[in-house]
């Protein structure tokens, strides 16, 4: 039995530009102790989209449901999306550590952007 | 129903050893994060130690880092606490405790009593 | 290491009204918009008790009496109306990811 499940439940999103976009990821557990990290794209050049304790992201919001008992929610909103957004996004548990060691990933969701 | 029932507790004295067990029935326990919290009047409650569903990741405070070791056998549905340099202020009432997610304690043992004197 | 504060250390209530216990952290303990605050209840001679989970949750079979509230550092248990068997200790407990994880020092909660 896997001891930590990240949890991406949408494959795709579809979103009109200008609007907002919900990306959803439940983690199993807080155990190991580290921080979740979203990514867009995956590999060494993934764009860090997400990260609570470091960095400045004006238009991602974290949207946890703390009403959900069996897991823990780490759904982010981006708001304003431009076609520039679409890409896969990736929801990323690490365990803490000098530095960080990332754990696993969730399946990756992908973001698709219509013309309003 | 959940139960969890400590047994291990006792006498010893300073510099001692101690092994508690716990013994989990009622739930999937290999799906659950376990862990040790003391009690002592003088202190409240203390969190002790903490180990991963599997068993792979563990985590101290440090006033217990490097004298007690936590480990846990699925397959017995069992939880261990190894503690050694066993000091007074270790002295107090030992709760197992566990956690679907990690975060809080959602149920308790009724605890076995540590008292570390000469 | 974060340090929880809870006050009254203790708190004489009439049957009937409202008992409001307080929890001061002395860093944040919200992650990802989420209060990693917990509350647990104690009676003499038995093992603490669940009663709200992530700051304002209340835990399956919990009377409805009790709600939590709050965020950051700031964080509240009210009772109401309190009830003769709600003559307990109650704790908090924070498990952000800064460990060690701790609890308050508690309050005790009479009947006036």
């Known amino acids: 039995e896997e001891e930590l499940q990240v949890i991406q439940p949408e494959k795709s999103v579809s979103v009109a530009a200008g609007d907002s976009a919900t990306l959803n990821c439940t983690v199993s557990s807080l155990i190991p102790v580290g921080p979740i990290q979203w990514f867009r794209g995956a590999g060494p050049g993934r764009e860090l989209i997400y990260n609570l304790k470091e960095g400045h992201f004006p238009r991602v919001t974290p949207v946890s449901d703390p009403t959900k008992r069996n897991n823990m929610d780490f759904s982010i909103r981006i708001s304003n999306i431009t076609p520039a957004d679409a890409g896969t996004y990736y929801c990323v548990k690490f365990r803490k550590g000098s530095p960080d060691v990332e754990l696993k990933s969730g399946a990756g969701t992908e973001l698709s952007v219509r013309a309003k | 129903e959940v139960q969890l029932v400590e047994s291990g507790g006792g006498l010893v004295k300073p510099g001692g050893s101690l092994r508690l067990s716990c013994a989990a029935s009622?739930?999937?326990?290999?799906?659950?994060?376990m862990s040790w919290v003391r009690q002592t009047p003088g202190k409240g409650l203390e969190w002790v130690a903490t180990i991963s569903s599997g068993g792979t990741y563990t985590y101290y405070p440090s006033s217990v880092k490097g004298r007690f070791t936590l480990s846990r056998d699925n397959a017995k549905n069992s939880l261990y606490l190894q503690m050694n340099s066993l000091r007074a202020e270790d002295t107090a009432v030992y709760y197992c405790a566990s956690s679907l997610t990690g975060s809080s304690f959602d149920y308790w043992g009724q605890g076995t009593t540590v008292t570390v004197s000469s | 290491d974060i340090v929880l504060t809870q006050s009254p250390a203790s708190l004489a209530v009439s049957l009937g009204e409202r008992a409001t216990i307080s929890c001061r952290a002395s860093e944040s303990v919200d992650l990802y918009g989420t209060s990693f605050m917990h509350w647990y209840q104690q009676k003499p001679g038995q093992p603490p008790k669940l009663l709200i989970y992530r700051a304002s949750n209340l835990e399956s079979g919990v009377p409805d009496r009790f709600s939590g509230s709050g965020s950051r550092t700031d964080f509240t248990l009210t009772i109401n109306p309190l009830q003769a068997e709600d003559v307990a200790t109650y704790y908090c407990?924070?498990?952000?990811?800064?460990?060690?994880?701790?609890f308050g020092g508690g309050t005790k909660v009479e009947i006036k």
């Open positions: 009622g739930f999937t326990f290999s799906s659950y994060v």
């Open positions: 407990h924070q498990s952000s990811d800064e460990l060690p994880w701790t």
